[in-house]
Each structure stands twice: as structure tokens, then as C-alpha cells.
């Protein structure tokens, strides 16, 4: 027995107390307006399509449609008794995108199209999304609209993030093949791009791809190998979107940051995290440059976003994504350093300014504390049994450190007979001494290494 659920109340005149399916009239295989229940709610009948008359003797509207009398009053049993006719109108008024890639004015029109399609033995049309095809549905009151501040930042900065590809020549055929890629970001409307120096290393042809897919040959304008910053230039007609540099000196630990890069054509990769430590002395983290500082973050920095910007929630660049030491520890070159580089680069190109020399050995390091040592020991079983010293994150190729035999993961524990407690100690000795006789803990043995610092441009 069918219940009379869904039937209008009060009951329409002449309805049986119980529904008897056997007494329902046969229905055609296809209904233009879809199926509906009759006025009594007993039998399935063909509903009237959108725009058709309803009420009176016309029968009910199809699925998703409601019977509306003039002035927009929905038809009820009372209206019907007053013998007024209405029109079938879709209960949903917003556009929808169908699986056939067509935009329909409302859900009812999509359903009608789906029925027509099935009648022709084609796949049904289903709803892919609310709103027109190719257009997101933006409900300004939705939670995702209100609280996706990371996505807002990404949307704002992405057009100025570029994909950089390097090509090498095969040794005999001289054919060019891609060898590496990284990211960069545009800093001037006429096509100056900042990236890591290690992204655009020597002997390679550099190609830049913008977010819109346009590709350009890039010229290397200036490189600071020690600070790991490079400036490259593309020739582009018209204005390019740019990113502004924020003040890394004003960063606070705990601030949200977003690392973005473009590791593949037309695609961005986004990671997010917080600032763990601001301005780790370089000094603390390395000697590409003795006054170099780094921002430490737990936002994942990898080959894909290396060279790309690390931005704050205002979309300002506060660093260049530069390297990952180990899980959860990544570093960025602070924007204040980028500003300095850009200013000096401008001066150099304008008037070939003389530069004072600095001493350099070619390592990146960080001060080892007991907690940091424990963390590293947990990750690497063979990490040395030390709780202080200067931990070497990276040895830069073709530098005094490499020539002397320093290796990644070494811990410097003394130089010229003086014990080394922190990375600062190493920086200070480099400034003073012309020869560094180091004792280095490697695994569980102590090794004597001699490094001769070289004088470099800052």
C-alpha cells in the first residue's frame, strides 16, 4: 500500500482513504516534465514541464517544479478550489553546470535535458557544480570564502611567480636537454626576476615561463653566489605583475608564512607554516656571507619551490625559499638581504662601484644546542655524540671549505685551539685568522682539517 506522504493538505476532494496502486492508470515510458504524484499522492503520473499550466484540471508539476499562480503565490488546494490556474516554475532559480559542459538556467532545465538525453539513449546529464560552467560558485557567506586566507594570498601573488628551467648541452650532439628547474618571482614590471643563485648555476641556458604559459630566454644580470641570490631578466612587452618586498626585520616568530613555487609549467606548489626563528645569524646558519641571516620556517621548502618567494599574509615577500635541512627545518634568505642585493646590483650596473672584500670559507652552518643535537640524532642514527659546536648544513662546491675537506653533517668543535660552541664563534675566527686549523667531529671520530679563507666580494 502506498502512503499519501507528500500530498497537499487539506486533502483534495475525491481522494480515496487508501491508495490502491492497481487502480493507477498506466504511464508512458518517457515524461517530458518528469514524474510526479497525482493530487491524491497515490499514483505516479507525468508531471507538467516547466512553463506549463498546472492546477485546475491540468495535473501536478514535474519533479523540482512548483505550481505558482499569478503574483507568485504557490498553488494550494484552496487556490485550486477557487478554480485559478498556475504555471509550473522551477523551485531552484540558480544556474547549474551540467556534465555535458552546458550551463542551465536552473536545475529543472538540466533535468529536462537529462531526460531528453536518456530518451536518445545517451548518458544522463548530471550536475557538476552550482553556478555557470567554468565559474566558481562564490558564496561570500560560506566558511571557505571567509576563512581561506592562505588561498587569498596565493591568488594574489601567483601571477608573479615564475617557473625557471635550465638546459644543458649533450657532450657530442650538443643538443639541449632540460637539466634542472626551480622558481623565481618578478620584482619589476619590465621583467627583472629574483631567484636563488644555485637555481641558475653556470654553463646553462635559462628559460623562464610565466603563469600564463608564455616563455622567454632569460639573461643573468647579477649573481651573489655567497648570499645565494641571482637577478635575471626577460624581455617582455607590456607590464608584468610584480611582488613587493616586505620587511623581514619586522617578522615575528609564529607568524604565518606561505612558500610558493612553480616547479612545473603552469602549476604552482604551495606550502605553509610559521616562522620558527627570525634572522638566524649567518653567523648561525652559514658563511656564504658573514653577515648573512636566514629565516627558519617549518613551511616545506624543496626543489620545487626553491628560488620562489616566502610571503606573509599581506602577500609581501619576506624571503627567498632556499634550502631544507631536514624534515621540519627549512630556511629562506630574508627580504632585507634581497633589498640590499638589488640596491647594490643597481649601483654596480650604474657605476661599477668598488666593493670591500670579506673573508669566506663556503659553508652553511647552524649552532648546535643540546635540543637540536637530540633532534638530529633522532633523525640520523650516525649523528655525532656532541651537544654544542657548529653543525655544517652544506659545503658549497669549489670553496675553501670543500678544498680543505669539510663535509655536510660535520660538527666543528674547535678552531686554532679555541673551542667552538656556536656558529658565531666560527664567523668571528674567520674574520680574524688567515688559516683555520679545525677539529671536526665526523660520525664518532675527530678529524683535523685546515681551511684557508678566501677574500670575496660581499
Amino acid at each position: 500500500q502506498l502512503s499519501r506522504a507528500g500530498r497537499s493538505a487539506p486533502l483534495a476532494a475525491g481522494c480515496p482513504d487508501r491508495c490502491e496502486p492497481a487502480r493507477c492508470p498506466p504511464q508512458p515510458e518517457h515524461c517530458e516534465g518528469g514524474r510526479a504524484r497525482d493530487a491524491c499522492g497515490c499514483c505516479e503520473v507525468c508531471g507538467a514541464p516547466e512553463g506549463a499550466a498546472c492546477g485546475l484540471q491540468e495535473g501536478p508539476c514535474g519533479e523540482g517544479l512548483q505550481c505558482v499562480v499569478p503574483f507568485g503565490v504557490p498553488a494550494s488546494a484552496t487556490v485550486r478550489r477557487r478554480a485559478q490556474a498556475g504555471l509550473c516554475v522551477c523551485a531552484s532559480s540558480e544556474p547549474v553546470c551540467g556534465s555535458d559542459a552546458n550551463t542551465y538556467a536552473n536545475l529543472c532545465q538540466l533535468r529536462a535535458a537529462s531526460r531528453r538525453s536518456e530518451r536518445l539513449h545517451r548518458p544522463p546529464v548530471i550536475v557538476l557544480q552550482r553556478g555557470a560552467c567554468g565559474q566558481g560558485q562564490e558564496d561570500p557567506n560560506s566558511l571557505r570564502h571567509k576563512y581561506n586566507f592562505i588561498a587569498d594570498v596565493v591568488e594574489k601573488i601567483a601571477p608573479a611567480v615564475v617557473h625557471i628551467e635550465l638546459f644543458r648541452k649533450l657532450p657530442f650532439s650538443k643538443r639541449e636537454v632540460p637539466v634542472a628547474s626551480g622558481s623565481g618571482f618578478i620584482v619589476s614590471e619590465d621583467g627583472l626576476i629574483v631567484t636563488n643563485a644555485h637555481v641558475v648555476t653556470n654553463k646553462h641556458r635559462v628559460k623562464v615561463e610565466l603563469k600564463n604559459g608564455a616563455t622567454y630566454e632569460a639573461k643573468i644580470k647579477d649573481v651573489d653566489e655567497k648570499a645565494d641570490i641571482a637577478l635575471i631578466k626577460i624581455d617582455h612587452q607590456g607590464k608584468l605583475p610584480v611582488l613587493l618586498l616586505g620587511r623581514s626585520s619586522e617578522l615575528r616568530p609564529g607568524e604565518f608564512v606561505v612558500a610558493i613555487g612553480s616547479p612545473f609549467s603552469l602549476q604552482n606548489t604551495v606550502t605553509t607554516g610559521i616562522v620558527s626563528t627570525t634572522q638566524r645569524g649567518g653567523k648561525e646558519l652559514g658563511l656564504r656571507n658573514s653577515d648573512m641571516d636566514y629565516i627558519q620556517t617549518d613551511a616545506i621548502i624543496n626543489y620545487g619551490n626553491s628560488g620562489g618567494p616566502l610571503v606573509n599574509l599581506d602577500g609581501e615577500v619576506i624571503g627567498i625559499n632556499t634550502l631544507k635541512v631536514t624534515a621540519g627545518i627549512s630556511f629562506a634568505i630574508p627580504s632585507d638581504k634581497i633589498k640590499k642585493f638589488l640596491t647594490e646590483s643597481h649601483d654596480r650596473q650604474a657605476k661599477g662601484k668598488a666593493i670591500t672584500k670579506k673573508k669566506y670559507i663556503g659553508i652553511r652552518m647552524m649552532s648546535l644546542t643540546s635540543s637540536k643535537a637530540k633532534e638530529l640524532k633522532d633523525r640520523h642514527r650516525d649523528f655525532p655524540d656532541v651537544i654544542s659546536g657548529a653543525y655544517i648544513i652544506e659545503v658549497i662546491p669549489d670553496t675553501p671549505a670543500e678544498a680543505g675537506g669539510l663535509k655536510e653533517n660535520d660538527v666543528i668543535i674547535s678552531i686554532n685551539g679555541q673551542s667552538v660552541v656556536s656558529a658565531n664563534d666560527v664567523s668571528d675566527v674567520i674574520k680574524r685568522e688567515s688559516t683555520l686549523n679545525m677539529v671536526v667531529r665526523r660520525g664518532n671520530e675527530d678529524i683535523m682539517i685546515t681551511v684557508i679563507p678566501e677574500e670575496i666580494d660581499p
Epitope: 644543458r168 649533450l170 657532450p171 657530442f172 650532439s173 643538443r175 636537454v177 632540460p178 637539466v179 634542472a180 648555476t201 653556470n202 654553463k203 646553462h204 662546491p397 669549489d398 670543500e402 678544498a403
Partner: antibody, heavy 123, light 105 residues
């Protein structure tokens, strides 16, 4: 992981030809040149030639010019080295080896090698 | 053609010893490469671009030099280091040194 698998040992008569194959896997075959290096018993390694699998372009050691032919089948990711007019001094282990490249310095070397194919030339 | 002279052609050392092999070339090259070859096996790259350690190679192996004179060093010889070592340059085309056979005393 990168693997180069060579065909099996061959015994040939003087004057004959030998064709050794090298099937590559684990990398984009057309992004690197494939080289052939041989080692006669108790001798140093000797470079024979190379091929760019994408274009079929080749380079040969003058010592073997006219006797060695290197080819490649892109669809099968396989390189071939054919040495003709064999003589007893061609008895050696023949290796295919992939050209490696140093990103930092831009230098070339051989980073992956096949297991070697012993070719014995004897009457 | 660039001529390569590797010395010594053979050497015997004890476990724990520091071992040095030299390679001289007839005209200046940018980089030197070093390989290890064990009997019946293909050569294995140890050092590239003169001084860079190839992936997975123990840190006891090192290389140095420039121009025409290059050095390969094993800081503390291990039993598994018994092999023949080759230097290789690549200017016009690749050539190899004649090899140094290393044995344990």
C-alpha cells in the same frame, strides 16, 4: 632506478661482425647520450663512441672509425654497438655506459654502466 | 690527443693506511673523474668534477688537483677497497688512465 642490461657473451671468428645490445630503464632514454667503452684483458678502459638516442647523432673514436656503428631504438630504449672486421685484439669486455652530467660544474662523466659483454675473437 | 699517466700502476697497503694515487695529463683539463673497478665488475664512479663525492660513496674517498696534476686519496684503507682505480678526463673525448691496482698487505 637506472639500469643498463647488455646482451650475452659472443664468440666470433676473425673478419666477422658482432652486435651488442644495451637496454636502458629507469630514466628518460632520450635525455642522455649512450656511450660504449671497451676493456681488453689487462688493458685500460677505451672509449669507442656515443649516440644521442633522440636524433641518432653519433661520435666515434678515430681508432674505430669505419669499423664501429652505434645505433639506438628509441621505442625500445635500447642502444646497439656493432663492430665489424673483427681481429683477435678486439677480444674484450664491451660496456655501454650512460653519460652523466655535473649540474654544479657542467662536467661530463659516466655514471651508470651495463654489466659488460665479453666478445671473444678466435679462429 | 691528451695523454694520461696514472701512478703507481700497483700498490700494496695495510688496512687503515692513507693511500694516494696521482694522475697527470699532457695538457690542462677542467676536471678529473675517478672510478673503482672490482674484478669481473663494471667500473663505478667515485669522484666527479675533481673533488665531488658521487652519491653513496664513503667519505674516506676524496679527490683534488687542477690543471694537469690530480690526486685521489683513501684516508683510511678498508678491506673492501681492494680494486683497480682509474682516472678519466673528458676534454675533446673521454680517455682513461692505465689504472692502479690496489692490494692489501
Amino acid at each position: 632506478q637506472v639500469q643498463l642490461v647488455q646482451s650475452g657473451a659472443e664468440v666470433k671468428k676473425p673478419g666477422a661482425s658482432v652486435k651488442v645490445s644495451c637496454k636502458a630503464s629507469g630514466y628518460t632514454f632520450t635525455d642522455y647520450e649512450m656511450h660504449w667503452v671497451r676493456q681488453a684483458p689487462g688493458q685500460r678502459l677505451e672509449w669507442m663512441g656515443a649516440i644521442d638516442p633522440e636524433t641518432g647523432g653519433t661520435a666515434y673514436n678515430q681508432k674505430f672509425k669505419g669499423r664501429v656503428t652505434i645505433t639506438a631504438d628509441k621505442s625500445a630504449s635500447t642502444a646497439y654497438m656493432e663492430l665489424s672486421s673483427l681481429r683477435s685484439e678486439d677480444t674484450a669486455v664491451y660496456y655501454c655506459t650512460r653519460e652523466g652530467y655535473s649540474y654544479e660544474g657542467g662536467g661530463y662523466y659516466f655514471d651508470y654502466w651495463g654489466q659488460g659483454t665479453l666478445v671473444t675473437v678466435s679462429s | 690527443d691528451i695523454q694520461m699517466t696514472q701512478s703507481p700502476s700497483s700498490l700494496s697497503a695495510s688496512v687503515g693506511d692513507r693511500v694516494t694515487i696521482t694522475c697527470s695529463v699532457s695538457s690542462s683539463v677542467s676536471y678529473m673523474y675517478w672510478y673503482q673497478q672490482k674484478p669481473g665488475k663494471a667500473p663505478k664512479l667515485l669522484i666527479y668534477d675533481t673533488s665531488n663525492l658521487a652519491s653513496g660513496v664513503p667519505s674516506r674517498f676524496s679527490g683534488s688537483g687542477s690543471g694537469t696534476d690530480f690526486t685521489f686519496t683513501i684516508s683510511s684503507l678498508q678491506p673492501e677497497d681492494i680494486a683497480t682505480y682509474y682516472c678519466q678526463q673528458w676534454s675533446d673525448y673521454p680517455t682513461f688512465g692505465q689504472g692502479t691496482k690496489l692490494e692489501i698487505k
